[in-house]
């Protein structure tokens, strides 16, 4: 079952999934000046059996100007490096080390893909939030959101992360702010 809405937005924060539940779709979007190849699928789909999950279909972009040339989908090393994101939280680091059953990993980039990935999430998906660079967590409550089905409707739980740009915390004597997690994701993810 697809989630009706996008995950909640948190001001000055971005969200990321560490793994994608089977049934998740990723739009094959191309950057400006490029388009999906005519025979290409409009999306990638996370599918699998009991033992293994993977993305079905491949996204391919071609120059809007050049009609008959299609580019190979092998990402350049610098592109791969550019898209590598910082770990978001200890849960994410843990999830990154083990393959979650019934989940796909982040799909590798394809050449000339759009800067923002548009996912269509399914019920049971969890996304994790982190303050962007230059902002700190005023309050670090549960910093994740889960798409749940209640009364026949899907809804995302509300993350309790508050990010602020205020530099001087109203700290009290003898209190220390917990260590901040690494700042920022280079790019945000969006669902539609």
């Amino acid at each position: 079952e697809l989630c009706d809405d996008d995950p909640p937005k948190i001001t000055h924060a971005t969200f990321k999934a560490v793994a994608y539940k089977e049934g998740t779709m990723l739009n094959c979007e191309c950057k400006r000046g490029f388009r999906r190849i005519k025979s290409g699928s409009p999306y990638m789909l996370c599918t699998g059996n009991s033992s293994h999950s993977s993305w079905d279909n491949q996204c391919q972009c071609t120059s809007s100007a050049a009609r008959n040339t299609t580019k190979q989908v092998t990402p350049q090393p610098e592109e791969q490096k550019e898209r590598k994101t910082t770990e978001m939280q200890s849960q994410m680091q843990l999830a990154d080390q083990v393959s979650l059953p019934g989940h796909c990993r982040e799909p590798p980039p394809w050449e000339n893909e759009a800067t923002e990935r548009i996912y269509h999430f399914v019920v049971g998906q969890t996304v994790y939030y982190q303050c962007v660079q230059g902002y700190r967590a005023l309050h670090r409550g549960p910093a994740e959101s889960v798409c749940k089905m209640t009364h026949g409707k899907t809804r995302w739980t509300q993350p309790q992360l508050i990010c602020t740009g205020e530099t001087e915390p109203s700290q009290f004597p003898g209190e220390e702010e917990p260590q901040a997690s690494p700042d920022g994701l280079p790019e945000s993810e969006t669902s539609r």
Epitope: K9, T11, R140, P169
Partner: antibody
Amino acid sequence: QVQLVQSGAEVKKPGASVKVSCKASGYTFTDYAMHWVRQAPGQGLEWMGVISTYSGDAIYAQKFQGRVTMTRDTSTSTVYMELSSLRSEDTAVYYCARGVTFDYWGQGTTVTVSS
Amino acid sequence: DIQMTQSPSSLSASVGDRVTITCRASQDISNYLEWYQQKPGKAPKLLVYNAKTLAEGVPSRFSGSGSGTDFTLTISSLQPEDFGTYYCQHHYDTPYTFGQGTKLEIK
């Protein structure tokens, strides 16, 4: 079930201070930040500030900067709001409200400032 | 600071009526908006969060819509218990501010 129970009504003289408490129960206290909102008689709602129950860090509305202090005691799951140098315009009902979306509110504490 | 302006400031409607209250933000606040209902002598109650998500236990006759600067709270079929004052509020960034309120009376 989630409950936010506030301390009782207070009558104060101008220039004095008042400390209002908000005791939380029915959920993990440090998961949700706590906001303070006040409402003068016959008026609308006014946001005063927010405190992280996790770190104790707080942000205050400019209007109350220097006069308000928000603290928390994790051992009793209680948040406090102290307002100093009281004036008659501070006569209001003071509410605590939970989390990003203010999903639960305390019952309110009436503070009357009168000479 | 972001200003929130509600309209109308008061209205009177009959049971069964469709009622619409609007809220305008002085700048783009995306969907960081809540609606509350307050009855005399009581604390406000959350109705809608993130512009359109109905809070738990809130009747389905209430709905929220809008994004950016213009938002709407709609009561599809007014019930006697729906009287009170309605407030919008943003949580885009501190300071969080409220609209001035809309007083809804039942005819």
